[in-house]
Interface confidence: medium
C-alpha cells in the first residue's frame, strides 16, 4: 500500500435499466456479528489525515511500549520502526521487552517507490483504545527503510489488516487480526470511520484533532446514518470488491465494467487517492472536466501535480460533479451505489504562499494495478470489514464533509445483470509479481 500518493470484455449492464429498484427483501438490517450498538471506548481512537494516513495507538512488549501505528487495509504485515530514523520520535526497542521472541528470519518489502526491511519476531500487543485484550502477534521490526516513514506524520509503524495471502515474506506469517480473532473472543470484523477535516491541518492540529474511529469486533451505529449496504469480498487477499458501473453527475461512463476492475478493485485505507485504471481515469477526468467546464483548470491539476486555490471560503463546490461507484450487491443481479462529493476528491493542502487561500489537490489518480478506493473514498463512508461473512459494508459517515446542497450517499438496490463478468481474472504465475 502506498501512503501519500501511492501508498474478452463485456458490459455486464444488460437487462433492466439501472434506475429500476428491486424491492427490499426486508427493512431489517442483516444480523451483524459482534456486539451491536455502542463501542464508546473505541470511538475517536484514530488520528491523522488522508495525505499521511490514519493511525491508532498500540502498545508492544513488556513493559508496554506505546507507538502510533498506521491503519492499512491494503497490506497484511504488522511492522514497526525498530531503529533510530530521522522521521521517528520513538521506536520499538526489542531489547527492553521481556516477552519478545526472535523468529530468526528477515523480511524485505519493496514498494513502487521505497521499501522497508526488518527482522521477524513475536511479542505481546494491545490496543489501549480497543478491545481489552492482549495478543501475541508477529511483528516485523523495521531496521532499514527508504521513503516509507513520512516526516511529520506522527506514526511509527503500520498495521496491515488484509489477509495472509499478501503477507510478507509469505502467507505463513499470520497477520495481526487473524491472531487477535484466534486468541480472543473478538468477532472477526472491524469497521473504519475516517474523518477528513475538509481543510488542511498543521502538525499541532493533527495531534489535537480526532481523525476517526476503528471499531474492532463490531459496528457502532452512532458513526453512520441510513443503512449499511454490503458488497461481497471477491477474494481474501486484499479487500477485493467488484465495481459494476461508474457515473459522473449521474452520467454513465459507459465502459465495459471489466475495465473498472482491471486488474482488481480494492478498499485500501493506506492509500490517499481514489486510483483508477488508465482507461477509466482518462474517461473519468474527461467527464469531470466537462462537468466543471465553467472553469478551465491546468493539466497539472488533473495530473495531481498542481494545486488550485480559491480565496478562503469561496471554493465553488457546485461546479464539480459527484462521482458514483456501483458495487456488486449481496443478492443476485442487485447492486448499490456509493456517491462521493468534490469535498472528498479535492484534497485540502497548505498553500505555501498565503493563508488567505483554500488550496486543493485533485485526489483521483491513475493506476496500473487496478482501482484503489483509498482514503478519499473512505472519508465519505463508514466502512465495515465483515471478514466473518466475507463482505464489506458501506454507509454514509456521520463525519463526512459536505455542503448545504449535496451529501455523500449510499443507495440501492439497483438491477444489474451479469455482474460476475465485471471481475477480472488475474493470470496465475508461479512467481509473485506483487508490488504493493
Amino acid at each position: 500500500t502506498q501512503h501519500g500518493i501511492r501508498l474478452p470484455l463485456r458490459s455486464g449492464l444488460g437487462g433492466a435499466p439501472l434506475g429500476l429498484r428491486l424491492p427490499r427483501e426486508t427493512d431489517e438490517e442483516p444480523e451483524e456479528p459482534g456486539r451491536r450498538g455502542s463501542f464508546v471506548e473505541m470511538v475517536d481512537n484514530l488520528r491523522g489525515k488522508s495525505g499521511q494516513g490514519y493511525y491508532v495507538e498500540m502498545t508492544v512488549g513488556s513493559p508496554p511500549q506505546t507507538l502510533n501505528i498506521l491503519v492499512d487495509t491494503g497490506s497484511s504485515n504488522f511492522a514497526v520502526g525498530a531503529a533510530p530514523h530521522p522521521f521517528l520520535h520513538r521506536y520499538y526497542q526489542r531489547q527492553l521487552s521481556s516477552t519478545y521472541r526472535d523468529l530468526r528470519k528477515g523480511v524485505y518489502v519493496p514498494y513502487t517507490q521505497g521499501k522497508w526491511e526488518g527482522e521477524l519476531g513475536t511479542d505481546l500487543v494491545s490496543i489501549p483504545h480497543g478491545p481489552n485484550v492482549t495478543v501475541r502477534a508477529n511483528i516485523a521490526a523495521i531496521t532499514e527503510s527508504d521513503k516509507f516513514f513520512i516526516n511529520g506524520s506522527n506514526w511509527e509503524g503500520i498495521l496491515g489488516l488484509a489477509y495472509a495471502e499478501i503477507a510478507r515474506p509469505d502467507d505463513s506469517l499470520e497477520p495481526f487480526f487473524d491472531s487477535l480473532v484466534k486468541q480472543t473472543h473478538v468477532p472477526n470484523l472491524f469497521s473504519l470511520q475516517l474523518c477528513g477535516a475538509g481543510f488542511p491541518l498543521n502538525q499541532s492540529e493533527v495531534l489535537a484533532s480526532v481523525g476517526g474511529s476503528m471499531i474492532i469486533g463490531g459496528i457502532d451505529h452512532s458513526l453512520y446514518t441510513g443503512s449499511l449496504w454490503y458488497t461481497p469480498i471477491r477474494r481474501e487477499w486484499y479487500y477485493e470488491v467488484i465495481i459494476v458501473r461508474v457515473e459522473i453527475n449521474g452520467q454513465d461512463l459507459k465502459m465495459d465494467c471489466k475495465e473498472y476492475n482491471y486488474d482488481k478493485s480494492i478498499v485500501d485505507s493506506g492509500t490517499t487517492n481514489l486510483r483508477l485504471p488508465k482507461k477509466v481515469f482518462e474517461a473519468a477526468v474527461k467527464s469531470i472536466k466537462a462537468a466543471s467546464s465553467t472553469e478551465k483548470f491546468p493539466d497539472g491539476f488533473w495530473l495531481g501535480e498542481q494545486l488550485v486555490c480559491w480565496q478562503a471560503g469561496t471554493t465553488p463546490w457546485n461546479i464539480f460533479p459527484v462521482i458514483s461507484l456501483y458495487l456488486m450487491g449481496e443478492v443476485t443481479n442487485q447492486s448499490f451505489r456509493i456517491t462521493i462529493l468534490p469535498q472528498q476528491y479535492l484534497r485540502p493542502v497548505e498553500d505555501v504562499a498565503t493563508s488567505q487561500d483554500d488550496c486543493y489537490k485533485f485526489a483521483i489518480s491513475q493506476s496500473s494495478t487496478g482501482t484503489v478506493m483509498g482514503a478519499v473514498i473512505m472519508e465519505g463512508f463508514y466502512v465495515v470489514f465483515d471478514r466473518a461473512r466475507k463482505r464489506i459494508g458501506f454507509a454514509v459517515s456521520a463525519c463526512h464533509v459536505h455542503d448545504e446542497f449535496r451529501t455523500a450517499a449510499v443507495e440501492g438496490p439497483f438491477v444489474t445483470l451479469d455482474m460476475e463478468d465485471c471481475g477480472y481474472n488475474i493470470p496465475q504465475t508461479d512467481e509473485s509479481t506483487l508490488m504493493t
Epitope: 483548470f297 491546468p298 498542481q306 494545486l307 480565496q311 465553488p316 505555501v352
Partner: nanobody
C-alpha cells in the same frame, strides 16, 4: 467572464525598454496566478515570466533573465512586464496569461497548456 487586456507594446530600438501592462477583470471570487508568454512568427508560444508558483516566486525564461522583471499589483488587478535591454530576438506578440492553479512543488507552471485565460496579445518589435 474573465478578461485580460494588454497594453504597452510598440516598436523600439535594440537596447531600449518597454513596459507592458495587463489589466484583469472578472475575477469575482478567486485569485489567479498571472504571467507573460510570447509567440514569435513561426515559433511556439513560450513562457517569458510567470508568477504561477505557490511560493510566490517568479519564473523567468533563461533568455530574459536579468533583463525582464514581472510584477503584480493585486489592488489594481494588474500585472506588469518591465523589459530592458531589448534585443531583436525579443520581437513577438506578448500575451498576458492567468492560470487557475499554482505549482506546489517549486517547478514553474510555464507551459501554455496550463493557462486558463489569455489576453489578445500586444506586439513588440525590436529593430537593430
Amino acid at each position: 467572464d474573465v478578461q485580460l487586456q494588454e497594453s504597452g507594446g510598440g516598436s523600439v530600438q535594440a537596447g531600449g525598454s518597454l513596459r507592458l501592462s495587463c489589466v484583469a477583470s472578472g475575477f469575482t471570487y478567486r485569485r489567479y496566478f498571472m504571467g507573460w508568454f510570447r509567440q514569435a512568427p513561426g515559433k511556439e508560444r513560450e513562457a517569458v515570466a510567470t508568477m504561477f508558483s505557490c511560493g510566490g516566486t517568479t519564473y523567468y525564461a533563461d533568455s530574459v533573465k536579468g533583463r525582464f522583471t514581472a510584477t503584480q499589483d493585486n489592488a489594481k488587478n494588474t500585472v506588469y512586464l518591465q523589459m530592458n535591454n531589448l534585443k531583436p530576438e525579443d520581437t513577438a506578440i506578448y500575451y498576458c496569461a492567468a492560470a487557475s492553479g499554482c505549482w506546489y512543488d517549486g517547478s514553474p507552471a510555464a507551459r501554455s497548456v496550463d493557462v486558463s485565460f489569455w489576453g489578445h496579445g500586444t506586439q513588440v518589435t525590436v529593430s537593430s
